[in-house]
Amino acid sequence: APHQASSLSCDPAGVCDGRSRSLSSIPSGLTAAVKSLDLSNNRIAYVGSSDLRKCVNLRALRLGANSIHTVEEDSFSSLGSLEHLDLSYNHLSNLSSSWFKSLSTLKFLNLLGNPYKTLGETPLFSHLPNLRILKIGNNDTFAEIQAKDFQGLTFLQELEIGASHLQRYAPKSLRSIQNISHLILHMRRPALLPKIFVDLLSSLEYLELRNTDFSTFNFSDVSINEPSTVMKKFTFRKAEITDASFTEIVKLLNYVSGALEVEFDDCTLNGRGDFSTSALDTIKSLGNVETLTVRRLHIPQFFLFYDLRSIYSLTGAVKRITIENSKVFLVPCSLSQHLKSLEYLDLSENLMSEEYLKNSACEHAWPFLHTLILRQNHLKSLEKTGEVLVTLKNLTNLDISKNNFDSMPETCQWPEKMKYLNLSSTRIHSLTHCLPQTLEVLDISNNNLNSFSLSLPQLKELYISRNKLKTLPDASFLPMLSVLRISRNTINTFSKEQLDSFQKLKTLEAGGNNFICSCDFLSFTQGQQALAQVLSDWPENYLCDSPSHVRGQRVQDTRLSLTECHR
């Protein structure tokens, strides 16, 4: 028996959920009330002409991860309002342009993971003027991009192509799309990449390559009139790179002018940093790469790394570098000195210790650095860390959170312009004059602090949540404070007088504390309308801890009897 619409769960707005219900067909009885229909992860094999005929108000149709092998020509003909169509991971071996001819409002189309070899004989997308996100191809059979495949498309926010086994690319195929914000290309073997790349120079803003094996990649010189002025970003995700192919990848960047961001995520470098100097010499300085991001780089032969001097000349213009979770324990002094334009350096989740950081932050290192992030490294001594960083004359922001400092010495040296310091999750249990007096923002949340009695005359923001404080800090220590986040401590109460003493306070977050709901406290918190403007997490996070008969109640809602208040 066919499945009924009653096998779906629909809300009053017409959003119907039929995911993972072992449905073998589209339920019957669907009406114009349905606005969104999710039938993904079922066993549907066939979409018939009449299955969706009455769904004239349907905006989103999700049929991904089924067993669909046939879609009748006019199955979607009544879906004149459809904006989102997902047919991914089915068994469609032939695609038909007639499916889409009535879908002029379609913005999102996902055809990934179906076993077609090509996109068909006629242009599939020529009736989709509003299409903004398109996902096509698969990881095994999709073999050819044809010249007419993208006809009719002028602007795409995102184009994803599963081209792991692409064998043929007709030149200029992608050139028909005038503007592509983001192209995601799954391409195991990059032999066709240069051809494709050339066609994107005038239209693409952001190229993301996934799962590419660059081991034998050779970027043959291509003839172009002028470099791309629109391309802004490259991402290499899960790529395999060798020393030789790294040089070839860098050549890609020669064809781009203007500021550029380059990102390597989850890549493997099967090399020893032995980058060919002669080949690198042919590359113009990477004067246009301003942002370099490397996350989870795997270097099997890390300890065999050669001298990186061959790439120093390419780094002079880089302003922002992130190298995260890549087992970095040392940045060579000579490299630091070559990073003459660097303003922002994020080395989160690495292996930096103070002593090797000293080598990195040597004299004349990173002369313009203003932000340094060393979150979750191997720093142990706050005193040594500050001392080592004194060479960084322009450093204003320092994040050394998630390092195990435990204690704080009485005094420390710091760069003289320090304004922001993040010491959250560092196991510290007391504060001392080690903290720089110049600070404007201090984050010491998630530690073991039970008091705050330190004068910081310029501090504007204090984040001290998840500690063991019993009271609000004394306002006289913090005359400029405008933001105080002190939630999840052990504060019992605070008063109007305390709040008024913070003359510049605009935001207080103090929820999640153990409030004693005394008559005075309730009278103050419930009687001050303006308090809601200051308390950013009011009323939901303010619960009574005592008296016991009101424990767990919201402070805002708690009422004590007259007898309790006039004993």
Partner: antibody, heavy 118, light 111 residues
Amino acid sequence: QVQLVQSGSELKKPGASVKLSCKASGFTFTTYGINWVRQAPGQGLEWIGWIYPRDGSTNFNENFKDRATITVDTSASTAYMELSSLRSEDTAVYFCARLTGGTFLDYWGQGTTVTVSS
Amino acid sequence: DIVLTQSPATLSLSPGERATLSCRASESVEYYGTSLMQWYQQKPGQPPKLLIFGASNVESGVPDRFSGSGSGTDFTLKISRVEAEDVGMYFCQQSRKLPWTFGGGTKVEIK
């Protein structure tokens, strides 16, 4: 405070396998590497290999590559080292040690004595 | 593999004397200006204890009579005034190349 507590002594027959444990406390387990080093009676120290609990990546001394397996249970903050096809030359004290700064072993377990004898 | 040769095999000193322990590597352990050489102390029945890392950095909690020096292939551990509690084996270790290797050790004893 940082502590590495190792499992108790083992007596094994040649050809058998042994699995040693090393329970860590006092630091964020996934942030540091764990190394295994052994010391035969009256001898020097021999590095076996390491694991980084954050991503499970390992590196081994070639002499042990075919016989040693290093694993972690991050939920229990525990590292394990299994050595198979034991021979009498594997009789030694086996230490686990925390790897800091990518290069040095700053905290060591108390050691587990493994005796291989028929 | 990098071979580390320690000398002397045994060092016998009176309390208050200066101890000089040597470690020579078969190839350089230099890594971008930092020598990846460590020194450990091991007392009988105990695990090794880190004294020096990166050739010259003294581990926190280690008495300041211990110091390390050297670069490239030649390294020295000095104990300025030996005390009775300093007896034991001293091992050098390189982490420049895999496999990491240890020296054969120098035994320090008090006369």
